[in-house]
Structures are given as C-alpha cells and as structure tokens.
Amino acid sequence: NADGLKEPLSFHVTWIASFYNHSWKQNLVSGWLSDLQTHTWDSNSSTIVFLCPWSRGNFSNEEWKELETLFRIRTIRSFEGIRRYAHELQFEYPFEIQVTGGCELHSGKVSGSFLQLAYQGSDFVSFQNNSWLPYPVAGNMAKHFCKVLNQNQHENDITHNLLSDTCPRFILGLLDAGKAHLQRQVKPEAWLSHGPSPGPGHLQLVCHVSGFYPKPVWVMWMRGEQEQQGTQRGDILPSADGTWYLRATLEVAAGEAADLSCRVKHSSLEGQDIVLYWEHHSSVG
C-alpha cells in the first residue's frame, strides 16, 4: 500500500467509559487511523486534541467546532443515560462500556461503516443502517437497551450521518493531508541478544528489530538459506516516535547456534536485507 498502511484502512473513534459507582465515572476517547492514534479528547476542556500536524484533515474550523460540540453533548448524554438506566438494565457497578465506531476504505473507496458497543468486554449492541440492534447472545438486557437508544430518531440520524457521510469524507481528507507522513520509509535497526535460558544446554536467541515504518516487516532466523521454522515472532509493538518494534526468538541447543543468522526484510531497505550472524554478536542482554 502506497500510504504505508495495510488495507483495509479504517478511521475509528473509541470511547471507553468506566462506571465505578452511581456518581464516579471516567472516560477515554481516542481517534485512530488504522493503528495510528491521530486524536484524543480532553474531557476537562471538551476539546479534540490533534496528535499529528495533519490530524485536521481537510475539515474546516467550523466543522471541528461542531464535532466538538456533538462529542461534548453525546458524552454527557451517554453517561447520564447509562447511569439512569443502569439498574433497569441490570448493569452492576463497577462496569465498563466500550464503544467503537468508524468507517473502512478498500482500494481508495469507502466500503462500509461500523458502530459497536460492548458491556464488560462482550458484544452488546450495534448500530445498523439507522437503528440500534442487539447482539443475539446479549439477551433481553440488550434488547431493552436498544429500545431505549432507538427512542430518539434525531440521535440516530446524526449517528447514521456521522458514519455514512462525515467519516468517509474525513478519512479521505486525512489520508491526503497525512500523505507525506504515511508514505515515509524508515529503515529498521537490528541487534541480537540472549534471551532467558530455556533449560540446560539450550539457548534462546533474540533478534530485535526497531524503528521501522511502515509496519509490514519480515524477520526470520536462518541457517544459511534455510528458514528456521522454530522462529517465534512477537507482536509488532508501537514506539513513541510512530515507528515499530519487533522481536523474533529461536530456541536451539548450545552447540547449534554458530551458523545461525537473523534476516530482516522491509520496504525501506529496497531489497538490501539486513543479515546479522549470531557468531559475530557480542554478548549483550
């Protein structure tokens, strides 16, 4: 993908609300372009915080001001509504509500939108077309919640419009505004270390790869040209500077480490793979 982000691309907003008791609650709101956080919500000032210079996309100040107003109104309304109906819905304190909503892009075209709400980490209700529907597994509580949510058609009209119209327009503008940043290529650094000993006479070899962008990367322990199937890839983890980190480990008998190497392929390397040989590495870590 030219934008350095894997298809399908999505923009989504997440709202995590923790209800500790009837009067004490907390919430976290964030906006994401695929796995890159682009926005956060400052509850104290009821303002959207733009985390990247291009996070405004092509929306005007007036549009942002209106979106801020809607988020403020809806956060207050949602908290109040959930608090009011908690007993009726058999929500037991402390509980957590997670909401994620946004839209997806396939080959530069909007392919759909989504809005889901989870209660205590389980699917509860979702927004389809122009109304809320319960997840069948969520039972009668979810059905009742939908009945409450669907009482206000104006609310649903705004929600539908945000998902079907505002979000698709925004993601396209965001990709355009962030093009230079998203299309950048940052070369990885790699180094080798010992991991914790897996047992007597065995070694854990660790290949660290850090500071690369975009995210797709190939890392493998090799013996000559032979890929070592025992290679364990960790999760690709985010770094504070917007690049990525990954470690790949391999367990081997102590005498079999000598001719092993770690090979790293990444788009920024333009075919010039990084190859690090275990026998050359100095004992660090």
Epitope: E66, I76, I158
Partner: antibody
Amino acid sequence: EVQLVESGGGLVQPGGSLRLSCAASGFTFTDHYMTWVRQAPGKGLEWVAFIRNKAGGYTTESNPAVKGRFTISRDNAKNSLYLQMNSLRAEDTAVYYCARETTGIPTGWFAYWGQGTLVTVSS
Amino acid sequence: DIQMTQSPSSLSASVGDRVTITCLASEDIYFDLAWYQQKPGKAPKLLIYGGDRLKEGVPSRFSGSGSGTDYTLTISSLQPEDFATYYCQQSYSYPYTFGQGTKLEIK
C-alpha cells in the same frame, strides 16, 4: 457562497394547493438535509419538515401539524427543494423559509436561510 | 413534543446594558439548544448552538449557558444593532420546537 432562494408563494383559497420551491447553490446539495420553517405574521417560528440527504436515503420527517397535507421533496439534478401544500387552511398563512444546517451533519442548528416566501390562505 | 418557554416575551433596554433571556424546556434537552436573532422582514440568524457555542462571526458579547431544561442567552453590552427578536430552539428530538420569542426594544 451558500444561497437559498424561495419562490412560489402567493394568495390561495382555503382548501387550495400551492407548491413552494427553493433553489440552492454554493454547496453540494446531496450532502445536506434540507428544511422548511414557517412564521405566521407577527408570530414565532415553526419547523415544518425536512428531507434527508443522500446518506439518509432522501427520506422525510414532518411536523404533526402538517402531516398528510404537506409533502417535502427534492430534485437533486436541479439543486431544488419543494414543499407541496394541499388542503390549505387560514392558519397556514405564513412566510415559509428554506433552511440548511451549518455542515452536512443534521444537528438541527440552522446556519443558512433563504429570504422567505409569503403564503396567504384567505377567501 | 418538547415545549419551549421563553421569558420575558418583551424587554426594554438601553445601549450598553447587560441583557439576559431565558428558555425553559419541558424536558431535559442535554445542551441541544440554539439561539437565533431575527430583525423585521429578515430571516433568522444563528447565534449560539449546542447551548453555549458561539457561531463563527458572531460578536463575543453574545454568550449562551445552561443545562438540563434551563438555558440563557446573555448580551454583555447591548449595541444598537442588537435590538431584534430572539428565539431559542431545541433540536434534541423531533419535531424541532422554538420558543415564542423575546422582543428586545430600545428603552
């Protein structure tokens, strides 16, 4: 620049019909809900009806006071909004305004208004 | 339908005065309130939305406040061009409803 221009008002007898038009320009018409609001002489404002945008499937919503008598519609090719008024009553006498929200989000906060067209229902 | 009750219905004030107009909704409208200014023979003009957000281009002497069912429009220092009729409007639920208006006149 957003422009809304109403036309079609006039004098009509009780029980009669009239069709109002609103010509829109300066924005992508299909992205917006479009609304009619009226104001009886010397009285306050009253929301009449709206028609949703493309994302909303161009469906309509109207005030119970006019439901069944007034029909809102749009011609997207002509960037035009209409209000077909049937079975008119004396209490429908008002200036009819065409209005639009600030952005494409149907907040109900009307930032753009036409100049209005006067409908008088009298025998 | 949500009823919107504005008070006072008319008000006499002088240039430089601080003026307050209130709007009472028949149920909680969660900040979903707009204020409009209308001059004779003209269309209404949006001043405030979301209860307290000033529309771009509107002078900062206008401010909105309130929550729940009670909302207020304040003009901190009246200017000659502010003499007009003011309306509140709820857009919390359909049908949208307006207050009956407050006519602000020169004393």
